[in-house]
Structure formats: C-alpha cells, structure tokens
Interface confidence: low
C-alpha cells in the first residue's frame, strides 16, 4: 500500500503519500476551529507509470496509452485512496461543539 | 456533473471529461481483443480550483491550501468518478469468448 509505512521510509518519485501539516489559520484562513490548531493532512503526489498501484482497468489502459504515446495529455494521476476523519472543537457562541469532519486525513494513495 | 453532457458542450479549462478514443492495437499494443477494435475511453483533465467538484473534505482543504500557497506542490487532481464496463470479444484458440471488462469507460470526473 502507498501509505506512510512505505512512502515515508522510501525515496519514491512515483505516486506516494507525502507529509503535509495544515495550520487552519495560517494555511486555510479558518479561524472557527478552536482545536486542533492544525493537523497532518498529508497529500498524494508522484508519477503513475504503467501498473503502479492502478486503481481501475481504465487507469491501467491510460498509463499504458501514456507509455506508448508519451506526448499525450491523457495520463493517470496520483490521488488519495484511504481517508480518515478528524475530530474538531469549535464554538457556537460560548458553547463548545465537537464534530467529526469526514475524509480529512489521507492515509494512502493510488493512481487513478 | 462533470460528464459528457456538460464537458463536451463547454470549453472548460477546469477539471472535466475529455474525449479519448483508444485503438487497442495502435495505442495499447493489444492484439488479443477481436471486437471492438477500439472504444471511447475518455479521460479526465483540467485544473482543480477551490470548490470545483471536490470529491472529499480533504480535496476542499487541499485546493484552498493551494490557493493560499500557490507555490506548494500539494494540489488536488482531476480524476475519474463514474466508470462503465466495456464488452469485448476475444478468442481462446478457435473458441470465441465474450467478457465484460469493468471500469473501462470514464463517464464523469471529480477533483480528488
């Protein structure tokens, strides 16, 4: 799996999970989230050569097409596969609210 | 939806469905598929600005992060959303076989 266990331990130019810390105020301009201040969102990036963690049959077709036709603009892209939620604390007036924001943390990647 | 009905009728730089015809022999080097000779595979391409057909909350976060930090390498990517199968005819010896290859045709796209 193209997850932290693999990607953070290997120098990998191909599609892999990359570390990314997001500070809500600084990076997004969000002031409404009280806790946490930020979180390890991570992101996916890297090349998608033929058969490199292909998501679907179409991805395989596209990467093979791109290999044979390298000048073509059609090529697969490295995107998130497994995501996890993030629990946040915010206030409505003086009342603290806890909410789970789904799909906030990328845990692994794929070529799609 | 970023499908043919919208994307093929509009000039759209942002993430959208793009037409792509794949010839099995010419483009993939596949000689084993007897029918069809090729098919409209389509593909997804284009920019993913903030809130443009975002797949997940993480995609929204990433595109907003990319807006505020345009030099960052972390940005969402335009990929396939809905896919359809393709029915093919091939031969094993002299015996014709019909098979449905899943996820071969892209019908719509998303930013992920």
């Amino acid at each position: 799996a193209l997850d932290a266990a693999y990607c953070f331990r290997n120098v990998q130019d191909n599609c892999c999970l990359r570390p990314l810390y997001i500070d809500f105020k600084r990076d997004l301009g969000w002031k409404w989230i009280h806790e946490p201040k930020g979180y390890n969102a991570n992101f996916c990036a890297g090349a998608c050569p033929y058969l490199w963690s292909s998501d679907t049959q179409h991805t395989k077709v596209l990467s093979l097409y791109n290999t044979i036709n390298p000048e073509a603009s059609a090529s697969p892209c490295c995107v998130s596969q497994d995501l996890e939620p993030l629990t946040i604390l915010y206030y409505i007036g003086n009342t603290p609210k806890i909410e789970q924001l789904s799909n906030m943390i990328v845990k692994s990647c794929k070529c799609s | 939806a970023l499908d043919a009905a919208y994307c093929f009728r509009n000039v759209q730089d942002n993430c959208c469905l793009r037409p792509l015809y794949i010839d099995f022999k010419r483009d993939l080097g596949w000689k084993w598929i007897h029918e069809p000779k090729g098919y409209n595979a389509n593909f997804c391409a284009g920019a993913c600005p903030y809130l443009w057909s975002s797949d997940t909350q993480h995609t929204k976060v990433l595109s907003l992060y990319n807006t505020i930090n345009p030099e960052a390498s972390a940005s969402p990517c335009c990929v396939s959303q809905d896919l359809e199968p393709l029915t093919i005819l091939y031969y094993i010896g002299n015996t014709p076989k019909i098979e449905q290859l899943s996820n071969m045709i892209v019908k719509s796209c998303k930013c992920s």
Epitope: Y21, H34, E35, P36, K37, Y39, N40, T87, L89, P96 | -
Partner: antibody, heavy 118, light 108 residues
C-alpha cells in the same frame, strides 16, 4: 463560584461494582464537558475520557474503553464514573475536571480515592 | 499512541529560573497546557493555550511552545513552587494525553 464536588472515598473488594459522582455548581453544567482523570499511587495523571452532559456524548481513552462507563444526569448537574467489576489495579485517586478544550481543565474536583482490596 | 516526554526531575536554586520541557511529535502544532500538583492536592492549571495564565497564577509562570517542545518557565522560583508539573495536549485524533510529570525541587 465554580465548584466540582466529588463523592467520598470508597473501599471495595475485587469483582464489586462502583459508581462515583462529580457534582458541578456555579456554572451552566451542560455547557462544558466533564473529564475524568486517574492517578495511581505515586504515579502521574492519565486521561480516562469525557462526557458532554448536554448531549451525553462520550469519548474514552483507548486504555479505558470498555473498562469504565462515563455518564451524566444533567437534571442534577452530576457526572458519574462507574465500574461493573473492580480489579485491584483500579486502586487510584480519580479526579473529575471541567474541560474547556482538549487537555485544558480549568476546575478540578477534590478527588475520590478508590481502594480495591480483598 | 501519542506520548509527551518530560524530565523526571528539575532542580532550581531559590530565586533562579526553572525550565521544564515537554516534548512530543509536532507538539508546536497543538495547544499545550501545564498543571501544578502539590502533594495530597488536586492539580491546578497554571498555563493554558501555550502561554496564557489563568487568573490567580503569578506572572512568574510563563509558557512557550514551538517545534516539538513546550516549555514551562518559572522565574524567581520560590519554595512554594515545589510540586509536580504536568504538561497536557492531544494527538491528531484528539485523544488527550498527559506528560509523565516533572518533580520540581527548589534548593536553598
């Protein structure tokens, strides 16, 4: 003024059940979370979990999930910590605390000492 | 699971400055809070949100937090400052965690 008053010390035998309490006063009880913190003899503080008395939402530390139950009765502004079957290793001081945000407890109860011994 | 690491003990001469550290992965990205606990008493909040003091806590107590380390600084240390000090924060799943505690001894 804000106060959290806990129930008195308890001496129990292994296998017995127990429910200790924490009564809040001087503030709107349903507006703030109540957390429970364990301190074993001579050891440090351990967060056990919290409850939102307004909604009765709870969250437990993985170490305490399934070992204890946190509840609240907002009509009497009281939070509870209970065990269905005590073990000797549950011997500790238990504190409740008003929680403003993660890790941020501004008022604490005086503590309830629980001793489990055969 | 997320861990916060503190020194077991710190000694400071009367009237001097004591610094107690708390380290954890990317701790600077989260809020860190500090508690003082004297023998036989409940903990007391002395610093919250990295560097803010609750009312009633002397200005001698201050906090900072960056990188992987939060620091509690007690200037002009007094005998009454002798206590156990705990840092507290949380991980990305918002599971709260306390440091192991540091025993502060004021010498002289």
């Amino acid at each position: 003024q804000v106060q959290l008053v806990q129930s008195g010390a308890e001496v129990k035998k292994p296998g017995e059940s127990l429910k200790i309490s924490c009564k809040g006063s001087g503030y709107s009880f349903t507006r703030y979370y109540v957390a429970w913190v364990r301190q074993m003899p001579g050891k440090g503080l351990e967060w056990m979990g919290w409850i939102d008395p307004g909604q009765s939402n709870t969250r437990y530390s993985p170490s305490f999930q399934g070992q204890v139950t946190i509840s609240a009765d907002k009509s009497i502004s009281t939070a509870y910590l209970q065990w269905s079957s005590l073990k000797a290793s549950d011997t500790a001081m238990y504190y409740c605390a008003r929680m403003l945000a993660w890790g941020w407890f501004d008022y604490w109860g005086q503590g309830t000492l629980v001793t489990v011994s055969s | 699971s997320y861990e916060l690491t503190q020194p077991l003990s710190v000694s400071v001469a009367l009237g001097q400055t004591a610094r107690i550290t708390c380290s954890g992965d990317n701790l600077g990205g989260y809020y860190a809070h500090w508690y003082q606990q004297k023998p036989g008493q409940a903990p007391v909040l002395v610093i919250y949100d990295k560097s803010d003091r609750p009312s009633g806590i002397p200005e001698r107590f201050s906090g900072s937090n960056s990188g992987n380390t939060a620091t509690l600084t007690i200037s002009r240390a007094q005998a009454g400052d002798e206590a156990d000090y705990y840092c507290a924060s949380y991980d990305s799943s918002l599971m709260m965690v306390f440091g192991g505690g540091t025993k502060l001894t004021v010498l002289g």
